[in-house]
Interface confidence: low
C-alpha cells in the first residue's frame, strides 16, 4: 500500500533530487497546522504571518485585528490569551524553559478599551502559570509555588497559599513526575465553569531523593542542578486537593476535597479533576499500584461550605490483565444531565471502548464496539458526540473523526473523514468551538497535512485554513521515499509496520536495513502521517530501507497485545523487532550483512537490548538516551508497567532486564552511545552506568555526549546528533562519504 | 439497524431439547453483540444467554452447563441449543441485539428485539 500522494514526475528525471541531510537540519521540508483559538460557538482568533492577532467571524465571513503586532513587539510578546469578557489580553514574554511542559515567563496586560497596558498592581516576575476565569476577567497565577488572585487585571492580588517552596511545596503546578507522568501539563489549577470556584493541587515532595548532576555552564565551578525525583520504589510526592470560592477567597478559605477511603488506605496518586458544574467537580485518583483507579463526584455543600463525595458516586476501574487505562487513565466527558458520563475503558473483548456510565461502571452501556479501539472524545453536546477511532478499513495507525447521534434512538454513527480525501488524508485530529458549532479538522497525512474548516451541524467543509501549498511546491522535485504500511502475522500476534523505500527501489536489488524502535507501552510507531526527516533522507540519498515495527506493549490494538509486556518490560518488545527483521530478510532484497538499529529513550533500550541479544542479525546500533536499568527511571512511569522493585513484588526482573547485565554481547556489534549530561529525564546515569559495564567486559564501542543537553538535545546538538549517526552508519553500511 | 426473527419454539417434556433459531436481517450482523432473553407469565424479561461479536460468551447461572449459544455469522444466525429443559423454563423466548459488549443484563441495554417465541415445558 503506497501512502505517498502520487505526483506528476517532471519528464527529464534529472531535474529530481535525493533529499540532503541539510534539508533535514534546516527544517526545509517542515508543515504547518492550523489550530483556532476558539473564543465563542463561531469566532476564533488566530496570529497572523505578521503577528496581528485577528479576530474571525466565521457567520459574518469578517475579520479585524483585535491586537497589532507592534503592541506585541512594544513587550517582545510571543503569546497571548484574550480575557473571556473580551476586555484585557495577556502578553507572554521572555519565555524560560523548564521541564517538558514548564516554563516562566513574564506576563504584561494590556487593557483593550482604552488600548494601554494595565499599570499598578503589576504581575511579578517570572510567572510559573498564569490563566484567565472562564467568565469575565479573574486572574489566577502562581509565583514561587504560591497561588495568588486577581478579581480584575489591575486589583491587588488575593494570595491564597503561603507554603509554597522551591522543591519542596508546589501549589497550583506540579512537581517533576507529576508534570511529566501524570498530568502532562505545567499547571495543577482548574476553573469551574463559571469561575466561581478555582480548584487547585498541592505536592509536597519534602521526602523525595534528589537527583543531582552537573550543569557545566560558562562558569569556572559547574552549578548543581537538584529535582526532587522518586525513582522506581522509592517516595513519592503527597497529593492534596483544595478548592476556594473565588468571589469571597477569605471567607472560609481553601476546603480541601476528601480522597476515596479505598486510595486512600495505601499509596496514591491524584490523576486529573473535571468540572461538572460550578458545584460540582469529578477527581481521579490512582493507587500506586496502578491497577485500580477511582472516579469520585463531589458536590458543594452550601451549608458547610465543604465538598462532599459520596461513596455512591465513587466508580472504580480496576484492570484484570495489566494497568488502569491506556498511557494514562481516560478522563469523563459529561453530559448535559451533569451527572452521567462519557469515557473510553476497555470492554470484556479487551478493547478500548467509549462507555456511558449512568449510575455503575457495571452497568456501563457500551457506545463503541469492535476489534478496534476509540481513541479520544473530542465533544459531547446535546445530540452528538464526536470521537476519533482507528476503525477504517482496520488499520490501527489511521485516525478518523466520528459523529455518534445520541439525540436519537437508536444512535447512528457517521464517519466525518473517511472519505473527505482518502488518499491524502488518514490520520486526523479536531478542534472544536462552543457547542460544537463549527470545528477544524487537522489532517497529519500521509499526504501532505491540511487543515480544514467544517460546519458542526451539516459536516459541511468551509473553507481551507492551511494546505502547506509552499511545501507542495518545494517538494515538486525531490525524490521522496515510498512508504508502505503493511502487517506480519507471526504466533497469533499481528506486528503492523511501516517500511521506507528508497525513490528507485527494485525488489531484485539488496539494501541495508535501519530498525527504528520506540517501542515504549502503549506507543504508536506505525502511523499514517507524512514526514520529511532523518530517516527519509536516508532512504532518498543513501539508499537504506528503514522499517517501524508496532510489537508488543503498544497501543491501539487491544489489551492482548498491550498489557503482554506488563511486568515484563525489555522481553516481548525487543523478540518482536526480531522476529519483523526475520521476516523483512525472507522478503528478499535486505542485505543481511548490513542491518542496524536505532531508537532514542524507550528505543535506545529496545535498541541496545536488541544489539545484545545474541542473535547476530545486527552488524551495529544506536541507542540516545537510553534507559539503560528500570530501577533509574521515575517511579510513576516506570511501576505502572513494572509493579514495585521489591523482593516479594517484581525486583527479579528489574534486575534481570537491564542492559547492563547484557554488557558481554555487545562484543560482536558495533554499538554507538550518546546522552545529554543534562538530561532531567533519563539520567546521564543511564549511560554511564552502560558505558561503564561495557568498559569492565572490556567491550570496544562508541560514544557521544552532549554538554548541558536534555533529553531532546535540542539546537546545534541536534544538527551535531544526525551528522554524527549518519557517518556512523554509512561506516557502518560501507556507504562512500 | 437489524431486525430479528426467532424460531424453534414449542411444547416439550421434562428433560428434552429444543433448538431455537434467530435470523438477523440487515447489515453488519458480525459487529452485533447477540442475546436469548426469557419471559415467563408475570415475571421480569432476564438474559439467558449472550454472546458477543468476538465470540465471548455468558450465561445465566439457572442454565449453565445446559443451555449453549453460539452464532454462524455466514448465515446471520444466532443459536440457542437448550438441554434438559424443566418445567421453570417454560417462557417466551426472545431474541435480541446490540452494538457493543454482551456482558448485559438488562432489558434496558438491548435496543433491538424479536417478536419471541414460546417454549413450553411439561412435567
Known amino acids: 500500500i503506497v501512502l505517498r500522494p502520487s505526483r506528476v514526475h517532471n519528464s527529464e528525471e534529472n531535474t529530481m533530487r535525493a533529499l540532503t541531510l541539510k534539508d533535514i537540519l534546516n527544517g526545509t521540508f517542515s508543515y504547518k497546522t492550523f489550530f483556532p483559538n476558539w473564543i465563542s460557538g463561531q469566532e476564533y482568533l488566530h496570529q497572523s504571518a505578521d503577528n496581528n492577532i485577528v479576530l474571525y467571524n466565521i457567520e459574518t465571513g469578517q475579520s479585524y485585528t483585535i491586537l497589532s503586532n507592534r503592541t506585541m513587539k512594544s513587550v517582545n510578546a510571543s503569546n497571548y490569551g484574550l480575557s473571556p469578557d473580551r476586555q484585557f489580553v495577556y502578553l507572554e514574554s521572555d519565555y524560560s524553559k523548564l521541564w517538558r511542559y514548564s516554563y516562566t515567563a513574564t506576563y504584561y496586560i494590556y487593557d483593550l478599551s482604552n488600548g494601554e497596558f494595565v499599570r499598578g498592581n503589576e504581575l511579578p516576575r517570572p510567572i510559573q502559570y498564569l490563566c484567565w476565569s472562564p467568565v469575565g476577567s479573574k486572574l489566577a497565577y502562581v509565583y514561587q509555588n504560591n497561588i495568588y488572585l486577581k478579581q480584575r487585571p489591575g486589583d491587588p492580588p488575593f494570595q491564597i497559599t503561603f507554603n509554597g517552596r522551591e522543591n519542596k511545596i508546589f501549589n497550583g503546578i506540579p512537581d517533576w513526575v507529576y508534570e511529566e507522568e501524570m498530568l502532562a501539563t505545567k499547571y495543577a489549577l482548574w476553573w469551574s465553569p463559571n469561575g466561581k470556584f478555582l480548584a487547585y493541587a498541592e505536592f509536597n515532595d519534602t521526602d523525595i531523593p534528589v537527583i543531582a548532576y552537573s550543569y557545566y555552564g560558562d562558569e569556572q565551578y559547574p552549578r548543581t542542578i537538584n529535582i526532587p525525583y522518586p525513582k522506581a520504589g522509592a517516595k513519592n510526592p503527597v497529593v492534596r486537593i483544595f478548592i476556594i470560592d473565588t468571589t469571597y477567597p477569605a471567607y472560609v478559605g481553601p476546603q480541601e476535597v476528601p480522597v476515596p477511603a479505598m486510595i486512600a488506605s495505601s499509596d496514591y496518586y491524584f490523576s486529573w479533576l473535571t468540572w461538572v458544574t460550578d458545584e460540582r467537580v469529578c477527581l481521579q485518583w490512582l493507587k500506586r499500584v496502578q491497577n485500580v483507579s477511582v472516579l469520585s463526584i463531589c458536590d458543594f455543600r452550601e451549608d458547610w461550605q465543604t465538598w462532599d463525595c459520596p461513596k455512591t458516586q465513587e466508580h472504580i476501574e480496576e484492570s484484570r490483565t495489566g494497568w488502569a487505562g491506556g498511557f494514562f487513565v481516560s478522563t469523563p466527558v459529561f453530559s448535559y444531565d451533569a451527572i452521567s458520563y462519557y469515557k473510553i475503558f476497555s470492554d470484556k473483548d479487551g478493547y478500548k471502548h467509549i462507555h456511558y456510565i449512568k449510575d455503575t461502571v457495571e452497568n456501563a452501556i457500551q457506545i463503541t464496539s469492535g476489534k478496534w479501539e476509540a481513541i479520544n472524545i473530542f465533544r459531547v453536546t446535546q445530540d452528538s458526540l464526536f470521537y476519533s477511532s482507528n476503525e477504517f478499513e482496520e488499520y490501527p495507525g489511521r485516525r478518523n473523526i466520528y459523529r455518534i447521534s445520541i439525540g436519537s434512538y437508536p444512535p447512528s454513527k457517521k464517519c466525518v473523514t473517511c472519505h473527505l480525501r482518502k488518499e491524502r488524508c488518514q490520520y486526523y485530529t479536531a478542534s472544536f468551538s462552543d457547542y460544537a458549532k463549527y470545528y477544524a479538522l487537522v489532517c497529519y497525512g500521509p499526504g501532505i497535512p491540511i487543515s480544514t474548516l467544517h460546519d458542526g451541524r451539516t459536516d459541511q467543509e468551509i473553507k481551507i485554513l492551511e494546505e502547506n501549498k509552499e511545501l507542495e511546491n518545494a517538494l515538486k522535485n525531490i525524490q521522496l521515499p515510498k512508504e508502505e504500511i503493511k502487517k506480519l502475522e507471526v504466533d497469533e500476534i499481528t506486528l503492523w509496520y511501516k517500511m521506507i523505500l528508497p525513490p528507485q527501489f527494485d525488489r531484485s536489488k539488496k539494501y541495508p536495513l535501519l530498525i527504528q524502535v520506540y517501542g515504549g507501552p502503549c506507543s504508536q510507531s506505525v502511523r499514517s502521517v507524512f514526514a520529511v526527516n532523518w530517516i527519509s533522507y536516508l532512504a532518498s540519498k543513501e539508499g537504506m530501507v528503514i522499517a517501524l515495527v508496532d510489537g508488543r506493549g503498544t497501543a491501539f490494538q487491544g489489551d492482548k497485545l498491550l498489557y503482554a509486556v506488563y511486568r515484563k518490560l525489555g522481553v516481548y518488545e525487543v523478540e518482536d523487532q526480531i522476529t519483523a527483521v526475520r521476516k523483512f530478510i525472507e522478503m528478499g532484497f535486505i542485505d543481511e550483512k548490513r542491518i542496524a538499529i536505532w531508537g532514542w529513550s524507550y528505543g535506545g533500550y529496545v535498541s541496545s537490548l536488541a544489539l545484545a541479544s545474541g542473535t547476530g542479525l545486527f552488524k551495529c546500533g544506536i541507542a540516545v538516551a537510553p534507559v539503560s536499568s528500570w530501577e533509574y527511571y521515575a517511579s510513576v512511569y516506570t511501576e505502572r508497567f513494572m509493579g514495585l522493585p521489591t523482593k516479594d513484588d517484581n525486583l527479579e526482573h528489574y534486575k534481570n532486564s537491564t542492559v547492563m547485565a547484557r554488557a558481554e554481547y555487545f562484543r560482536n556489534v558495533d554499538y554507538l552511545l550518546i546522552h545529554g549530561t543534562a538530561d532531567d529525564n533519563v539520567h546521564f546515569q543511564n549511560s554511564a552506568q552502560i558505558a561503564k559495564a561495557l568498559v569492565n567486559a572490556q567491550v570496544d564501542f562508541q560514544a557521544m555526549w552532549y554538554s548541558d543537553q536534555n533529553h531532546g538535545l535540542s539546537g546545534l546538538s541536534t544538527n551535531h546528533l544526525y551528522t554524527h549517526m549518519t557517518h556512523f552508519l554509512k561506516q557502518c553500511f560501507s556507504l562512500s562519504d | 439497524q437489524v431486525q430479528l426473527q426467532e424460531s424453534g419454539g414449542g411444547l416439550v417434556e421434562a428433560e428434552g431439547s429444543l433448538r431455537l433459531s434467530c435470523a438477523a436481517s440487515?447489515?453488519?450482523?458480525?459487529?452485533?453483540?447477540m442475546g436469548w432473553f426469557r419471559q415467563a407469565p408475570g415475571l421480569e424479561r432476564e438474559l439467558v444467554a449472550a454472546?458477543?461479536?468476538?465470540?465471548?460468551?455468558y450465561y445465566a447461572d439457572s442454565v449453565k452447563g445446559r443451555f449453549t449459544i453460539s452464532r454462524d455469522n455466514a448465515r446471520n444466525t444466532v443459536y440457542l441449543q437448550t438441554n434438559s429443559l424443566k418445567p421453570e423454563d417454560t417462557a417466551v423466548y426472545y431474541c435480541?441485539?446490540?452494538?457493543?459488549?454482551?456482558?448485559?443484563?438488562?432489558?434496558?441495554?438491548?435496543?433491538?428485539w424479536g417478536q419471541g417465541t414460546q417454549v413450553t415445558v411439561s412435567s
Open positions: 435480541a441485539a446490540r452494538t457493543g459488549g454482551a456482558a448485559y443484563t438488562r432489558r434496558i441495554d438491548w435496543p433491538y
Open positions: 440487515g447489515r453488519a450482523f458480525g459487529s452485533y453483540a
Open positions: 454472546i458477543s461479536s468476538g465470540g465471548t460468551t
